[in-house]
């Protein structure tokens, strides 16, 4: 058993049929010694008397808010949550496996630049009695500070018969060094509590591996005289790290016909312009990627050819 | 060339070769063999490798003030990785395919380090750590981890040379 926060405790249980459970001793936070009784949740049934209460925790019916009283007055509370371990593996019932980029991916994170700011998100089908708490650090043995905000519900989607809820959180490394080569990964830890079930989820990554630039901005076409060719130009997104001579991007320019089956023409360039042939009813799209490190491409910025 | 005395390197040549290194490091990575282990091998293999750190002067301001600190750090890393790529980790079982980019990568690391430090001048280099793989699967795991680490290192080096070529070239 360990303390999650004041008066909230997590009991770790090996979860299998007829498992013996864990013996837990609760102590009433009071100077009083006599006349103390214990109850669980809203029930008035007295579970025991005395300053300490010993219970065998085996299932969710044994978890909940234990309260010690004296003469009708509440002295203190202890909320017991359960953390299930099945066949040596902690349960992951609360969050949905996003399966990208690999199985058992519950948290996904992205950064728009090298400033040390990043966003993580996760999915669940649970709509009520759900709380999240997020902590983060750079490295784990001698952790350096990362400050995370509160997790918020950022989207709701209907998936078949189910509703899916997306939560997200923004974090910022306290002393980021954008030009350095990261040697210690960022660690993100999410505590999830649904009713009386506790679970924790972690992700470990380098900012360089979660970089996804915003799409290029100010995408423009300039027709070339007496030619089907156009000059496409664009700019670095405002959110990308500066100076651009140091934090350089590379670009992919694509000409795509109306039909998805039509052949796509693609050009790769380090410049912020390219000359392409503009076909009727086609569109021109440009996306960006770090020039020197193959993290994610940005989403496409597009303009019609006409 | 970056001579320990402090003259400027051939920024444009270094830029071109460092960008080539980035491409090679990424093309070599998936070709060192089928690898599920990399998903689980979470412990840092590469704590002993020279990283370009915050105080190494490889940021735009540090390069403007005195690029020598940074260039020395880059040179140290290039020599280090060149030795690793020539070690038993890459030459032992399982054998790399004859046309593997690792050979080109090895040669290019040497080429860039020589651009930075001509014959007769010596910056101190770092000892390569004893990672002591005894099994082929351990070598395979280390190859992945070393190439991942090299990708990060050459990305910073390439940024340095690109910025130098754009702003510090005579």
């Amino acid at each position: 058993i360990w303390e999650l926060k004041k008066d909230v405790y997590v009991v770790e249980l090996d979860w299998y049929p007829d498992a013996p459970g864990e013996m837990v001793v609760l102590t009433c936070d009071t100077p009083e010694e006599d006349g103390i009784t214990w109850t669980l949740d809203q029930s008035s049934e007295v579970l025991g008397s005395g300053k300490t209460l010993t219970i065998q925790v085996k299932e969710f019916g044994d978890a909940g808010q234990y309260t010690c009283h004296k003469g009708g007055e509440v002295l203190s509370h202890s909320l017991l949550l359960l953390h299930k371990k099945e066949d040596g593996i902690w349960s992951t019932d609360i969050l949905k496996d996003q399966k990208e980029p690999k199985n058992k991916t519950f948290l996904r994170c992205e950064a728009k630049n090298y400033s040390g700011r990043f966003t993580c998100w996760w999915l669940t089908t649970i709509s009520t009695d759900l709380t999240f708490s997020v902590k983060s650090s750079r490295g784990s043995s001698d952790p350096q500070g990362v400050t995370c905000g509160a997790a918020t519900l950022s989207a709701e989607r209907v998936r078949g018969d189910n509703k899916e809820y997306e939560y997200s959180v923004e974090c910022q490394e306290d002393s980021a060094c954008p030009a350095a080569e990261e040697s210690l990964p960022i660690e993100v830890m999410v505590d999830a509590v649904h009713k009386l079930k506790y679970e924790n989820y972690t992700s470990s990554f380098f900012i360089r591996d979660i970089i996804k630039p915003d799409p290029p901005k100010n995408l423009q076409l300039k027709p070339l005289k007496n030619s089907r060719q156009v000059e496409v130009s664009w700019e670095y997104p405002d959110t990308w790290s500066t100076p651009h001579s140091y934090f350089s991007l590379t670009f992919c320019v694509q000409v795509q016909g109306k039909s998805k089956r039509e052949k796509k023409d693609r050009v790769f360039t380090d410049k912020t312009s390219a000359t392409v042939i503009c076909r009727k009813n086609a569109s021109i799209s440009v996306r960006a990627q770090d020039r020197y490190y193959s993290s994610s491409w940005s989403e496409w910025a597009s303009v019609p050819c006409s | 060339r970056a001579v320990p005395g402090g003259s400027s390197p051939a920024w444009t040549q270094c830029q071109q070769l460092s960008q080539k290194l980035c491409t090679l490091a990424w093309s070599a990575h998936p070709l060192v063999g089928h690898m599920d282990l990399r998903e689980e091998g979470d412990e840092e293999t590469t704590n002993d490798v020279p990283h370009i750190q915050c105080g190494d002067g490889c940021d735009p301001q540090g390069l403007r003030d005195n690029s020598q600190f940074c260039l020395q750090r880059i040179h140290q890393g290039l020599i280090f990785y060149e030795k690793l790529l020539g070690s038993d980790i890459f030459t032992g079982e399982p054998s790399l395919l004859p046309d593997s980019p690792v050979g080109q990568l090895h040669a290019s690391l040497l080429g860039l380090s020589q651009l930075l430090q001509p014959e007769g001048h010596h910056w101190e280099t770092q000892q390569i750590p004893s990672l002591s793989p005894s099994q082929p699967w351990q070598r395979l795991l280390l190859r992945f981890k070393i190439l991942r680490s090299l990708q990060a290192f050459v990305a910073v080096a390439a940024r340095v040379f690109a910025h130098g070529a754009a702003t510090l070239s005579p």
Epitope: G88, I89 | G33, H34, M35, D36, L37, E40, G41, D42, E43, E44, T45, E93, P94, S95, P133, S134, Q135, P136, W137, Q138, L140, L141, L142, K145
Partner: antibody, heavy 121, light 111 residues
Framework: EVTLKESGPVLVKPTETLTLTCTVS????????ISWIRQPPGKALEWLGV???????NYNSGIKSRLTISKDNSKSQVVLTMTNMDPVDTATYYC???????????????WGQGTTVTVSS | DIVMTQSPDSLAVSLGERATINCRAS??????????MHWFQQKPGQPPKLLIY???NLESGVPDRFSGSGSRTDFTLTISSLQAEDVAVYYC?????????FGGGTKVEIK
């Protein structure tokens, strides 16, 4: 289908040399390592040695001086030679494929049926 | 050599009940976060069969009532609900250092 089949003498006299052949099918010896493992009657398993995809070998130091493992990739055969046999070498000898280096980390995913060798005069 | 110690030597479990076998290595069998610890099942007159590789990965075709856990020196094989066909001897094996070594085996029977 992946198969490994051991063949060789059933009975060997003390001090003689044992030669066992493992013939494999369904995969190439240039892609997978082969280990030899033995099991004395009613006892646990003992690893004898391995021949890697490139032809290099590692042997159990306890019997290294008596062992040689070689292979012929084109014939899909691996040969175990063990000199100076003794009654304590009586065992079932298995030839075993080591799983893909990048996934299995030394686990042996396919085993031959084994050949029982008795050492007796 | 790395010595692998299995416990218990034998285990009698009722059908449908849980069986747990432990394996302790005399030194760590992890290499940069990868546990080179594998579990085999051997039925009488048959060669061993791979069940679990790298401590916790279920080999293809093996029923999911088998699971493995652990790292460094302490490992566990669990059969969540014993079936009649699970009666066998179970071995752990390390492939972190030469020579590869096996545990002494645990015989699982039905109570």
């Amino acid at each position: 289908e992946v198969t490994l089949k051991e063949s060789g003498p059933v009975l060997v006299k003390p001090t003689e040399t044992l030669t066992l052949t493992c013939t494999v099918s369904g995969f190439s010896l240039t892609s997978y390592a082969i280990s030899w493992i033995r099991q004395p009657p009613g006892k646990a398993l003992e690893w004898l040695g391995v021949i890697w995809t490139g032809g290099g070998t590692n042997y159990n130091s306890g019997i290294k001086s008596r062992l040689t493992i070689s292979k012929d990739n084109s014939k899909s055969q691996v040969v175990l030679t063990m000199t100076n046999m003794d009654p304590v070498d009586t065992a079932t000898y298995y030839c075993v494929r080591e799983g893909d280096y990048g996934s299995y980390a030394g686990a042996m995913d396919y085993w031959g049926q084994g050949t029982t060798v008795t050492v007796s005069s | 050599d790395i010595v692998m110690t299995q416990s218990p030597d034998s285990l009698a479990v009722s059908l449908g009940e849980r069986a747990t076998i432990n394996c302790r290595a005399s030194e760590s069998v992890d290499y940069y976060g990868i546990s080179s610890m594998h579990w085999f099942q051997q039925k009488p007159g048959q060669p061993p069969k791979l069940l679990i590789y790298r401590a916790s990965n279920l080999e293809s075709g093996v029923p999911d009532r088998f699971s493995g856990s652990g790292s460094r020196t302490d490992f566990t094989l669990t059969i969540s609900s014993l079936q009649a066909e699970d009666v066998a001897v179970y071995y752990c094996q390390q492939a972190n250092k030469d020579p590869y070594t096996f545990g002494g085996g645990t015989k699982v029977e039905i109570k």
